[in-house]
Each structure stands twice: as structure tokens, then as C-alpha cells.
């Protein structure tokens, strides 16, 4: 949404992002000429964050709250440029596209990865999930594939019934929904994750030597 728009409010920062920013500033002050090894730096930050007490984290949580309020305030008055509106009208009653086996797997283990590595970007979380999926034998993917197939079957029935009923007028006219309905932060994150994971899934190559013994 409006990635190239200079007037678009800066995205809100999490408490952890504020903490990392502070770490960076401290590091710069102590070692003004040293170049930063980012993977090493983020690892140290992540470890430090994990050992911090709730009281110590409080300062950064307050900063994040204030930034969230700033972001919401600015977004109220922000008007996206023409042609920047998000997609055609989507009927909220339309059946939701079913998840793939890989996406089901991701939704199981994403919380653990995010929890254990709070500093990981969405892309890195998706990458890690992709590695885990590739580490999984074909027969161990079967429970996910079976569930995905069941959900696909259900979706196909639901979409057939939905189409038989006929789409709502707004959708027929192709009305553009200018304002994105307010969604929970988690839902937005999951949408981004889903896109990343679908890219991962396209790329990922299955282990060749696996045999298909069902559990």
C-alpha cells in the first residue's frame, strides 16, 4: 500500500525495534569507527532482550505505544494517491482460499520461531519455516497434506454454493473499496507471512530420497 508515497506515515515500531535502535546508538557511541556485523549484532540484541526483566522492557513498550498512537493519528488524515487503493471489492462472505500443507505447517511453528527469535524479520521467519519444511520427510508431511486436501475439498463445495447463490451487487459492479477495513495487527502480519511463505513454497524442493510410509 503506497510504498513509494513520501507522504505516507512511517510504519509503527515495536518495543523490540526501539530496543534494537537504542542498542545500535549505544554501539555507535562506544565504537564510532567500527563496522557492524549485523548477524552477530542482532544475535546479541536478541539474547539481551530475552534476559531483560518486564520492568526494563517497560520503557521500550511505552515508546512503542506512543509510536502506535502517532501512527494511528497520522493514518487518519492520510489520503493515499489515486490508483493506490487496495484491490477490488472483496466480499467478506466469500469462502476463504484454503491453506496449503506448507501454510498449515507454518501456522503451527511460526509462534515458536517468533518467540525464540524476537528479532527475526518476517522474511527470515519464512526462510526458517521453509528450511524446517524441507527437513521434514515426505511421509511426515502427509498429515498436513491430508488436512490441506480436506480443507480444499470443503472450499470447493463452499465456493460452488457461493457462486450458485450469486455474488453481491457491489462485487458485480466492481466497486473499489478505498479504505482498508481495520484489521487486527496479527491478521496483517499473517497476511504478509502468508505471501512470504507462498514464495518459499514455490522455491522449496522436496527431499528426493524420502519414501511414503503413512503414520
Amino acid at each position: 500500500m503506497g510504498k513509494g508515497d513520501p507522504k505516507k506515515p512511517r510504519g509503527k515500531m515495536s518495543s523490540y525495534a526501539f530496543f534494537v535502535q537504542t542498542c545500535r546508538e549505544e554501539h555507535k557511541k562506544k565504537h564510532p569507527d567500527a563496522s557492524v556485523n549485523f548477524s552477530e549484532f542482532s544475535k546479541k540484541c536478541s539474547e539481551r532482550w530475552k534476559t531483560m526483566s518486564a520492568k526494563e522492557k517497560g520503557k521500550f513498550e511505552d515508546m512503542a505505544k506512543a509510536d502506535k498512537a502517532r501512527y494511528e493519528r497520522e493514518m487518519k488524515t492520510y489520503i493515499p494517491p489515486k490508483g493506490e487503493t487496495k484491490k477490488k471489492f472483496k466480499d467478506p462472505n466469500a469462502p476463504k482460499r484454503p491453506p496449503s500443507a506448507f501454510f498449515l505447517f507454518c501456522s503451527e511453528y511460526r509462534p515458536k520461531i517468533k518467540g525464540e527469535h524476537p528479532g527475526l524479520s518476517i522474511g527470515d521467519v519464512a526462510k526458517k519455516l521453509g528450511e524446517m519444511w524441507n527437513n521434514t520427510a515426505a511421509d511426515d508431511k502427509q498429515p498436513y497434506e491430508k488436512k490441506a486436501a480436506k480443507l480444499k475439498e470443503k472450499y470447493e463445495k463452499d465456493i460452488a454454493a457461493y457462486r450458485a447463490k450469486g455474488k453481491p451487487d457491489a462485487a458485480k459492479k466492481g466497486v473499489v473499496k478505498a479504505e482498508k477495513s481495520k484489521k487486527k495487527k496479527e491478521e496483517e502480519e499473517d497476511e504478509e507471512d502468508e505471501e512470504d511463505e507462498e514464495e518459499e513454497e514455490d522455491e522449496e524442493d522436496e527431499d528426493e530420497e524420502e519414501d511414503d510410509d503413512d503414520e
Epitope: 503451527e108 510410509d213 503414520e215
Partner: antibody, heavy 119, light 108 residues
Framework: EVQLLESGGGLVQPGGSLRLSCAAS???????DMWWVRQAPGKGLEWVS?????????AYADSVKGRFTISRDNSKNTLYLQMNSLRAEDTATYYC????????????WGQGTLVTVSS | DIQMTQSPGTLSLSPGERATLSCRAT???????LAWYQQKPGQAPRLLIY???SRATGIPDRFSGSGSGTDFTLTISRLEPEDFAVYYC?????????FGQGTRLEIK
């Protein structure tokens, strides 16, 4: 400290039912796969059932398929095993164990609960 | 399904000696996903080694794992009195998870 504590074992007649529980503490239960593994008296270890973090996907050993049901309540940090149509060969100590994702080594185990199926 | 065979069935040694326990699979263990557990009477198994050679948290360095493909070994360099127990190997590369039948390590 990670702890797993099983309960619900006991003496039951063939054809009867039992529900085992495993109370977890000391870790974020909702992040982990959980397993039930059993050990018949004086015998080796046999996996029984597996469940993913959300509880939405499960798997069973052929020997218990259709008779046992694994479930979990993440709000209560508890794993369950509903055992129906019990047979003499189900007599064993039942352990709950924590795994990582998919088949994995079990890094923590409960102390076990003994199930005896006998008339 | 893969079958796991442990040998010997029983191993009689004295404290201070070196113990070598073997685990053989009927087919190659995928990515060497093999673990070793120790079980003492009346207790739950305890994870010692995973991924064939990585020591689990808190396991003394006298325990080491080696091997790949179908042949794996658990070595205890200098036996301590508390090491006398039953040892199981487990493959987790493919479903179903399979344990070996165990090796009893007893005091000579």
C-alpha cells in the same frame, strides 16, 4: 524448569476406557509438538500418538488407531489421551514427551503413569 | 518401516572402563536423525544424544555419539557408577518413529 506430569492411569477391564492427562509447566506449551510413548512391563519403548501445537493435526501408531484419541488444551497447558476399547496388550507405562516439530528426539519426558488392562 | 537393532543385548563392564553400544538400522536413517536415551529403573528415559552426534543439554562429555547411514555408536569414555542403565537408540528421520530394543549396561 520444564516439567511434565502424567495422571489418570490405573486398573481397567478389557473393553474399558481411561483418560490420561499430562500437565506441562516451565515452557511455552503451545509452541511444541507433544507425544505419548508407552513401555510394556520389562519391554522397550513404542510411540503411541503425536499432536501438533494447535491440536489440529494428529497421528497414531497402527496398534491404537481408531481406539485412542490425543488432544490438548493450550489454555490449561495439558495434553490428553482418551483410550477406549482397551486390550490386555495396552498394559504399559504411558509417558508424555515433548518434541520439536514432526518426528524428533524427545527432550523432556514425564515420569509416566501405569495403565493395567486386566479382568 | 525401518527396524533398529541394538547390540549387545547386555554389556557387563566395570566403572572406569569404556563402553561401546551399537545401533543398526535396516535402511539408511534420513539425515542421520538418530537419538540415544538412557533409562534407569523406575524412571523415564533421558535424552543423551540427538542428530547422531550432538549432546543434549546437561549431558556430560564422556557420552559421545557417532556413525551415519545405517550404523551408529554410543560411546561412554569412562564409566561412572550412575551410568549403569538401559540405553535405547531411536530413529526420527521417517515415520513411524522407531526405538531399538535397548542395551542393558550392567556392573561386572
Amino acid at each position: 524448569e520444564v516439567q511434565l506430569l502424567e495422571s489418570g492411569g490405573g486398573l481397567v477391564q478389557p473393553g474399558g476406557s481411561l483418560r490420561l492427562s499430562c500437565a506441562a509447566s516451565g515452557f511455552t506449551f503451545s509452541w511444541y509438538d507433544m507425544w505419548w510413548v508407552r513401555q510394556a512391563p520389562g519391554k522397550g519403548l513404542e510411540w503411541v500418538s503425536w499432536i501438533v501445537p494447535s491440536g489440529g493435526i494428529t497421528a497414531y501408531a497402527d496398534s491404537v488407531k481408531g481406539r485412542f484419541t490425543i488432544s490438548r488444551d493450550n489454555s490449561k497447558n495439558t495434553l490428553y489421551l482418551q483410550m477406549n476399547s482397551l486390550r490386555a496388550e495396552d498394559t504399559a507405562t504411558y509417558y508424555c514427551a515433548r518434541g520439536n516439530y514432526g518426528p524428533s528426539p524427545f527432550d523432556y519426558w514425564g515420569q509416566g503413569t501405569l495403565v493395567t488392562v486386566s479382568s | 518401516d525401518i527396524q533398529m537393532t541394538q547390540s549387545p543385548g547386555t554389556l557387563s563392564l566395570s566403572p572406569g572402563e569404556r563402553a561401546t553400544l551399537s545401533c543398526r538400522a535396516t535402511q539408511s536413517v534420513r539425515k542421520n536423525f538418530l537419538a540415544w536415551y538412557q533409562q534407569k529403573p523406575g524412571q523415564a528415559p533421558r535424552l543423551l544424544i540427538y542428530d547422531a552426534s550432538s549432546r543434549a543439554t546437561g549431558i556430560p562429555d564422556r557420552f559421545s555419539g557417532s556413525g551415519s547411514g545405517t550404523d551408529f555408536t554410543l560411546t561412554i569414555s569412562r564409566l561412572e557408577p550412575e551410568d549403569f542403565a538401559v540405553y535405547y537408540c531411536q530413529q526420527y528421520g521417517n515415520s513411524p518413529i522407531i526405538f531399538g530394543q535397548g542395551t542393558r549396561l550392567e556392573i561386572k
